[in-house]
């Protein structure tokens, strides 16, 4: 009763078809699968970026598979194959591992590559990025932007930099179709005549780093003598009102300071008749049913009522 | 005849825990790969997790990993679900199923009747 | 992860009609593809395996024919007993292993 082994795939090999991180993994079927021709022989494949305490865990029936790493560290990976119990009409069987590396070769130390990257995607319209040269280099280095995602042919290069002294420190890209929801990929490269600069390597999805344009139309209503209802309206752009979450800043009499964030786009306000000054500020951010992160909206501008019994008039800026 | 019975459901509060079994019979229980798919009320399918027919190979959906382990007991003909700090959206009804051929997921031939999971304060 | 997509959502038909429910692929899965029929307060029943394999028990009425991205289900003369929920699900690549969000068959 000779024991059935199965070898494992060949020629695992991890593929960069130039996307900035997005990788392809691939392999051929193990020698000798004649024995097992009524078989649908599955693979258990493991990667990671290097130093990565976990691995990520897939099985397929394909011949290939990809997602994306961080450049800026090697990729490890492993896979076997896997034959079911009905293969073999027993027990399952596994191949032992094959392996295999992939990492870009660093030029330039890593004092070179750009410092402190920031991205911000403005009313989910418009994404610039911008960062700093790297430290000690030369006047004469230059940086150069590339991105892809899924969706574009090849990597694009930055058209429209942010220049200060004569250095690209920034990026102002163009439309981006289809962008959102998905890994965006993002390469900073420089050249020097002195020496090599090191590249960077950056993913995010822009839906986490939208800015949105603070509320507009501050309004205040009477709603009943001990309460005040406050009003604003989204801002002007793409992000519907189900995004949204605001923080309100409320200022009453110069003194009393109430802060809250609310979902909607108002805000019922208890208050005395001695009121005789409420401000009020309001800021925007996308929410969780729309996005993982987000950043604030600058503060809209204030809206205020003095002086006359609020009951009498609603303001409207 | 292959039959599946879960037990173990019940209500529990946000944060607590739960332990949901599987008995099985009318199978070579050793071989096949079992998994979890729970359906919240009037909800889809949802795939949970799978473990293949040894134990030595267990996959979790993103929603619940950290959270859920699968495991079986061979001698026992028992698959289990520990489920550990619950949340309202974990409420549903889990059903276990055996895969019809493969390593830890495929085509469900057979199903469990299901048990009701309600997470409430 | 792959994702499925059915449709239609729900589909209103009579007793004889020829009904034709569509699954839609993120990406190639071949014909790594499982139908089910579950009925109000019932576990799903496989119907269709690897895209279109008739399950043993299953009537001849029903079959499944697709490969890749592109699927359906179709129930050649509907009869009552097959008023249902039906989902497809993709086991090519997991995990996840992915459904549909399911086509519900309701009487006309």
């Known amino acids: 009763d000779t024991e059935i082994k199965v070898n494992p795939p060949q020629d695992f090999e991890i593929v960069d078809p130039g996307y900035l991180g997005y990788l392809y993994l691939q392999w051929q079927p193990p020698l000798s699968l004649d024995h097992f021709k009524e078989c649908t022989v599955e693979y258990e494949l493991k990667y990671r970026n290097i130093g990565s305490e976990t691995w990520k865990t897939i099985i397929t029936k394909n011949l290939h598979y990809k997602d994306g790493f961080d450049l800026n560290k090697g990729i490890e990976a492993k896979i076997h194959t896997l034959l079911p119990w009905q293969c073999t009409n027993g027990s399952e069987v596994q191949s032992s591992w094959a392996e295999t590396t992939y990492w870009i070769s660093p030029q330039g130390i890593p004092e070179t590559k750009v410092q402190d990257m920031d991205c911000v995607y403005y009313n989910w319209q418009y994404l610039l990025c911008s960062w700093k040269p790297g430290i000690g280099v030369l006047l004469d280095t230059n940086y150069n932007l590339f991105y892809w995602y899924e969706g574009l042919d090849h990597a694009l290069q930055c058209v429209d930099y942010i220049k200060a002294d004569g250095q690209n420190i920034g990026c102002r890209f163009p439309y981006l179709e289809a962008s959102d929801y998905k890994d965006f990929y993002i390469c900073v490269n420089g050249s020097s005549e002195n020496k090599p600069i090191r590249s960077s390597y950056f993913t995010f999805q822009l839906q986490n780093i939208v800015k949105p344009l603070p509320p507009v139309y501050l309004t205040f209503t009477r709603e009943s003598s001990c309460e005040i209802k406050l009003k604003w309206s989204i801002p002007l752009g793409p992000i519907p009102a189900r995004c949204f979450d605001y923080e309100i800043e409320i200022r009453e009499d110069d003194t009393t300071l109430v802060t809250a964030t609310v979902e909607n786009e108002t805000y019922t306000l208890k208050t005395t008749n001695e009121t005789r000054q409420l401000c009020f500020v309001v800021r925007s951010k996308v929410n969780i049913y729309c996005s993982d992160d987000g950043i604030w909206s600058e503060w809209s501008d204030k809206q205020c009522w003095e002086g006359e019994d609020l009951s009498k008039k609603t303001l409207l800026r | 005849e292959v039959q599946l019975l879960e037990s173990g459901g019940g209500l529990v509060q946000p944060g607590g825990s739960l332990r949901l079994s599987c008995a099985a019979s009318?199978?070579?229980?050793?071989?096949?790969?079992l998994n979890w798919v729970r359906q919240a009320p009037g909800k889809g399918l949802e795939w949970v997790s799978a473990?293949?027919?040894?134990?030595?190979?267990?996959f979790y959906a993103d929603s619940v990993k950290g959270r859920f382990t699968i495991s079986r007991d061979n001698s026992k003909n028992t698959l289990y679900l520990q489920m550990n700090s619950l949340r309202a959206e974990d409420t549903a009804v889990y059903y276990c199923?055996?895969?019809?051929?493969?390593w830890g997921a495929g085509a469900f031939d057979y199903w469990g009747q299901g048990t009701l999971v309600t997470v409430s304060s | 992860d792959i994702q499925m997509t059915q449709s239609p959502s729900t589909l209103s038909a009579s007793v004889g009609d020829r009904v034709t429910i569509t699954c839609r692929a993120s990406?190639?899965?071949?014909?790594?593809l499982a139908w089910y029929q579950q009925k109000p307060g019932k576990a799903p029943k496989l119907l269709i395996y690897?895209?279109?394999s008739l399950e043993s028990g299953v009537p001849s009425r029903f079959s499944g024919s697709g490969s890749g991205t592109e699927f359906t289900l179709t129930i050649s003369s509907l009869q009552p007993d097959d008023f249902a929920t039906y989902y497809c699900?993709?086991?090519?690549?997991?995990?996840?292993?992915?459904f549909g969000q399911g086509t519900k068959v309701e009487i006309k």
């Open positions: 690897d895209a279109s």
């Open positions: 009318g199978f070579t229980f050793s071989r096949d790969a």
């Open positions: 990406q190639s899965i071949s014909s790594w």
């Open positions: 699900q993709q086991y090519d690549t997991y995990p996840p292993i992915t």
């Open positions: 199923a055996k895969v019809r051929y493969g």
């Open positions: 473990i293949s027919g040894s134990g030595g190979s267990t």
